[in-house]
């Protein structure tokens, strides 16, 4: 939008049952008009919870949300109801878009004159325009990973931001990788952290009219190997309908690099164990956490033949994690039976000590599951 | 409204240069940081550089730092994209995309012109 | 660089039904994920910005969500225009990664 236009959703139309929900962006100064219903029969406008009143500087009338000029007070969440039903007709998010009002040092102290348009807008010392951007304070994060901080601002005229590492400027010279800074998004970014870079770090945002700062606290883990961490519940019991399509899901947290299998449980001369315990398996899938979709094992077409027991096997360096769900196959005619019957949950997790290299893990199962 | 239009595809050898341009109107261009952003035929997305609105930041993927440049000419609304050493992985479609104020979402691309290279 | 996982790489459904699409990123990436719908020689088009935030213009059977490391995208009643190649993108890090793509068809 260009500061000169108007904010405007659409004309006024008869309310719609289907809710609409928009986010715009409005300069500040900016006029805005969002229509809602036609006339007598439009919707009433609500403002974080309050109905608007139909005068004043932001008011709610025969159905239309008129701000004469936006200022930052009136960003935030606006509602319109239809009068009798107080269904949702509309639902839209203001948000201040600062870049339409560039400084120029030209220009008169006292005031900002958009040069786009000829608007003169008041002095305003810099304020956060997401704080919601900014609720996370403290960053523990792994050594190696990315990290960023921001601290997106606004005011009149537009402010600057500069950055301090515990309370010295900081321009990442001495910081192996370099930082990057994006003035127009407010933000500090580092790869690959390491434990040195630990520290407070405060953006500063500054005009002319005054100033604010944040801090954030940044801590390194530095990384402790251990085997792979399955997510709780995952694989989760399935029931399904003979015919259908079934997704089984294992998510896999690991530093060293993992492999994973899914193995399905079998039966072998009437038996599922064998002598030495353990269970009888065939591989359905394996690879390495980076091949595409390893963590969703696919199950098409299904017949009471796929029922059972399936795993997630996940092996590192260091170790062994798995966990099992039960598939449940049912026949069309018990859809709605299964529809009432509430899902019993079993998840087997069993954990393997291995002090043995990643090639042994899987030679293992040779020993520890049978195929 | 807001228009992305790029110029300067075509057929060039392996080693060879190509610069593409893309004209932007119906917004303040210096106000929007751009970025390039490629896709192989019958392959996914690539980013491939984005530049800060007045200039200041620029940033590249791996893949072609150090053989692409990212510029501006903010007088005449144009983003560049001068491409030298170019490979046969580089044969894709160019997009020239806005970023959103305040984040880096494309909310708007360009149709797109198609690179490639081949002896 | 932070790599993006899209799953499933293709999925076939039906014109109504309710599809659901994951992405997980290789590190936390806060809320910095975007989606984007590409139809065949067509450019991409925004659909959710910042992980749930509905793109001007975009349908409200749409929707995003989740932060950190996993994300969704969710179409609530699949319509004929919505058959596409869909991809998410992070922009946690300075280098935009896109996920690989998921192809909705027709079943």
């Known amino acids: 939008l260009e500061a000169s236009e108007e904010v405007e959703l659409e004309p006024c139309l008869a309310p719609s049952m289907e809710q609409q929900e928009q986010e715009l962006t409005v300069a500040l100064g900016q006029p805005v008009r969002l229509c809602c219903g036609r006339a007598e029969r439009g919707g009433h406008w609500y403002k974080e919870g309050s109905r608007l009143a139909p005068a004043g500087r932001v008011r709610g009338w025969r159905g239309r949300l008129e701000i004469a000029s936006f200022l930052p007070e009136d960003a935030g969440r606006y509602l319109c109801l239809a009068r009798a039903s107080m269904i949702v007709l509309q639902n839209v998010t203001l948000t201040i878009d600062d870049s339409l009002t560039s400084s120029n040092d030209d220009e008169d102290p006292q005031s900002h004159r958009d040069s786009s348009n000829g608007h003169i807008y008041p002095q305003q010392a810099p304020y956060w325009t997401h704080p919601q951007r900014m609720e996370k304070k403290l960053h523990a994060v792994p050594a190696g990973n990315t990290v960023k901080f921001r601290c997106p601002a606004a005011g009149n005229p537009t402010p600057t931001i500069r950055w301090l590492k515990d309370g010295q400027a900081f321009h990442g010279e001495n910081r192996i990788g370099g930082i990057r800074l994006r003035h127009q998004h407010w933000s500090l970014v580092m790869e690959s952290v390491v434990p040195s870079d630990r520290g407070t770090y405060t953006c500063l945002v500054e005009n002319a009219v005054g100033s604010i700062r944040y801090n954030y606290l940044l801590d390194v883990l530095e990384r402790s190997p251990h085997r792979p961490i399955l997510q709780a519940g995952l694989p989760a019991n399935t029931t399904a309908v003979v015919g259908s399509d079934v997704e089984l899901l294992c998510k896999v947290y690991s530093d060293a690099q993992p492999h994973i299998q899914w193995l399905k449980h079998i039966v072998i001369n009437g038996s599922s164990f064998g002598a030495d315990g353990f269970p009888y398996v065939q591989v359905l899938k394996t690879a390495d956490i980076n091949s595409s979709e390893v963590e969703v094992l696919y199950l098409r077409n299904v017949s009471a033949e796929d029922a059972g027991e399936y795993t997630c096997l996940a092996g590192n360096s260091i170790g062994l994690s798995y966990q099992s769900a039960w598939l449940t196959v049912l026949p069309e005619e018990d859809l709605t039976w299964t529809a009432a019957t509430p899902e019993a949950r079993y998840t087997d997790k069993l954990e393997f000590r291995h002090d043995s290299g990643l090639n042994d893990i899987f030679e293992a199962q040779k020993i520890e599951w049978h195929e | 409204q807001v228009q992305l239009l790029e110029s300067g595809g075509g057929l060039v050898q392996p080693g060879g240069s190509l610069r593409l341009s893309c004209a932007a109107s119906?917004?303040?261009?210096?106000?929007?940081?751009m970025s390039w952003v490629r896709q192989a035929p019958g392959k996914g997305l690539e980013w491939v550089s984005v530049i800060e609105g007045d200039g200041s930041y620029t940033h590249y993927a791996d893949s072609v730092k150090g053989r692409f440049t990212i510029s501006r000419d903010n007088s005449k609304n144009t983003l560049y994209l001068q491409m030298n050493s170019l490979r046969a992985e580089d044969t894709a479609v160019y997009y020239c995309?806005?970023?959103?104020?305040?984040?880096?979402?494309?909310?708007?691309w360009g149709q797109g012109t198609l690179v490639t290279v081949s002896s | 660089d932070i790599q993006m996982t899209q799953s499933p790489s293709s999925l076939s459904a039906s014109v109504g039904d309710r599809v659901t699409i994951t992405c997980r990123a290789s590190?936390?990436?806060?809320?910095?994920l975007n989606w984007y719908q590409q139809k065949p020689g067509k450019a991409p088009k925004l659909l959710i910005y910042d992980a749930s935030n509905l793109q001007s213009g975009v349908p409200s059977r749409f929707s995003g969500s989740g932060s950190g490391t996993d994300f969704t995208l969710t179409i609530s009643s699949l319509q004929p225009e919505d058959f596409a190649v869909y991809y998410c993108?992070?922009?946690?890090?300075?280098?935009?990664?896109f996920g690989q793509g998921t192809k909705v068809e027709i079943k």
């Open positions: 995309a806005r970023e959103k104020t305040y984040s880096s979402a494309f909310d708007y």
């Open positions: 590190q936390d990436i806060s809320s910095d």
């Open positions: 993108q992070q922009h946690y890090s300075p280098s935009h990664t």
């Open positions: 119906g917004f303040t261009f210096s106000d929007y940081a």
